[in-house]
């Protein structure tokens, strides 16, 4: 299979008014409760030295994270938005189970790890800039993605 | 079928620590799509949500009891933890093991009756 | 952080029907609660979760008789055809603060 061919989404899945509404609502709330504006998660340094045919895959990667390390553990939060946005998410991040790349993922891998070791770092309040940031998430995917 | 038991000292002095764990049978602790709470009932009354913890870590707990409880996990022996400090009399209660799923506590241990008495 | 509502106590007639009501607090009548059923003696059980559109999902082996609905800011859990084994405290739960609340409890006597 030619590199990349499975690293799509359908644009059908950024098209749904109330699903994209509760994705936004979601990061809305928990923008409201962290209190650490100086850090930004997904901005232009996660997308550094990373070709545009390879930003979908650098997005999986943060999903699978998003959803795994941040989410499911405060998946008890932010009534009644986290609930619904988790499925849709998921069913995203099933639709990218088979995307992979053939080339040199280093500069993915670290902007990856950076990313990650940033939220560790910021331990609770770190996951809660997460979830600020599905928004950021949500139109990076799509914008990589589709 | 998932199912919790919870195991406990049944009898603690006062201004001592309590500690409580519960153990999973029919599934895995390390489900990353849930939560593991503990919830506690004193003797004829209501209620009362003490904390939760992910098999990762994420931990959090009831303001009105945050200073006193810790919980914890043990993924190698498919079990987690709650020990609260300095108990009193108020403390005696039965206390409960939970699973949460999105939030909403869908399985329960069947209970450990703590009594906190010199 | 919500409050969840409910009436000390109910009862209905063997065979009959009960509607239980769980009210949330101003500013959470959007949130999912869970109810759950304590029998004399022993510890909770969970019996379903309903959303705000009233849908809801049980939990294993809970009986047809259980139906759980919503309006507004109110969750109700429906009993029909009461039995005698029905009789028990009905709590609901809510969550999504970064704590989890209870309501008080609802006792239901089940009637001749």
């Known amino acids: 299979l030619p590199v990349n061919t499975r690293c799509k989404l359908e644009v059908s899945n950024f098209q749904q008014p109330y699903i994209v509404n509760r994705t936004f609502m979601l990061a809305k709330e928990a923008s409201l409760a962290d209190n650490n504006t100086d850090v930004r998660l997904i901005g232009e340094k996660l997308f550094r030295g990373v070709s545009a045919k390879d930003q979908c895959y650098l997005m999986k990667q943060v999903l699978n994270f998003t959803l795994e390390d941040v989410l499911l553990p405060q998946s008890d939060r932010f009534q009644p938005y986290m609930q619904e946005v988790v499925p849709f998410l998921t069913k995203l991040s099933n639709q990218l189970s088979s995307c992979h790349i053939s080339g040199d993922d280093q500069n993915i891998q670290k902007n990856v790890r950076r990313l990650k070791e940033t939220v560790k770092k910021l331990g609770e309040s770190g996951e809660i800039k997460a979830i600020g940031e599905l928004d950021l998430l949500f139109m990076s995917l799509r914008n990589a993605c589709v | 079928q998932v199912q919790l038991h919870e195991s406990g000292p049944g009898l603690v002095k006062p201004s001592e620590t309590l500690s409580v764990t519960c153990s999973l049978s029919?599934?895995?602790?390390?489900?990353?799509?849930?939560?593991w709470a503990w919830i506690r009932q004193p003797p004829e009354k209501g209620l009362e949500y003490i904390g939760r913890?992910?098999?990762?870590?994420?931990?959090s707990y009831n303001p009105s009891l945050k200073s006193r409880a810790a919980i914890s996990v043990d993924t190698a022996k498919n079990q987690f933890s709650l020990t609260l400090s300095a108990v009193t009399a108020a403390d005696t209660s039965f206390y409960y093991c939970?699973?949460?799923?999105?939030?909403?506590?869908?399985?329960w241990g069947q209970g450990t009756l703590v009594i906190v008495s010199s | 952080q919500p409050v969840l509502t409910q009436s000390p106590s109910a009862s209905a007639s063997l065979g009959a029907s009960i509607k239980l009501t769980c009210t949330l607090s101003?500013?959470?009548?959007?949130?999912?609660i869970a109810w759950h059923q304590q029998q004399s003696g022993k510890g909770p059980r969970f019996l379903m979760r309903?959303?705000?559109?009233?849908?809801?999902n049980k939990g294993d082996g809970i009986p047809d008789r259980f139906s759980g609905s919503s309006s507004g800011a109110e969750r109700y859990l429906t009993i029909s055809s009461l039995q005698s084994e029905d009789e028990a405290d009905y709590y609901c739960?809510?969550?999504?603060?970064?704590?989890?609340?209870f309501g008080t409890g609802t006792k239901v006597t089940v009637l001749g």
């Open positions: 913890i992910h098999y990762r870590g994420s931990v």
């Open positions: 939970a699973r949460l799923d999105m939030g909403a506590i869908d399985k």
């Open positions: 309903v959303n705000n559109g009233g849908s809801h």
């Open positions: 101003s500013g959470h009548s959007n949130y999912d």
């Open positions: 739960q809510t969550w999504g603060t970064g704590t989890h609340v």
């Open positions: 029919g599934g895995s602790i390390s489900s990353s799509s849930h939560l």
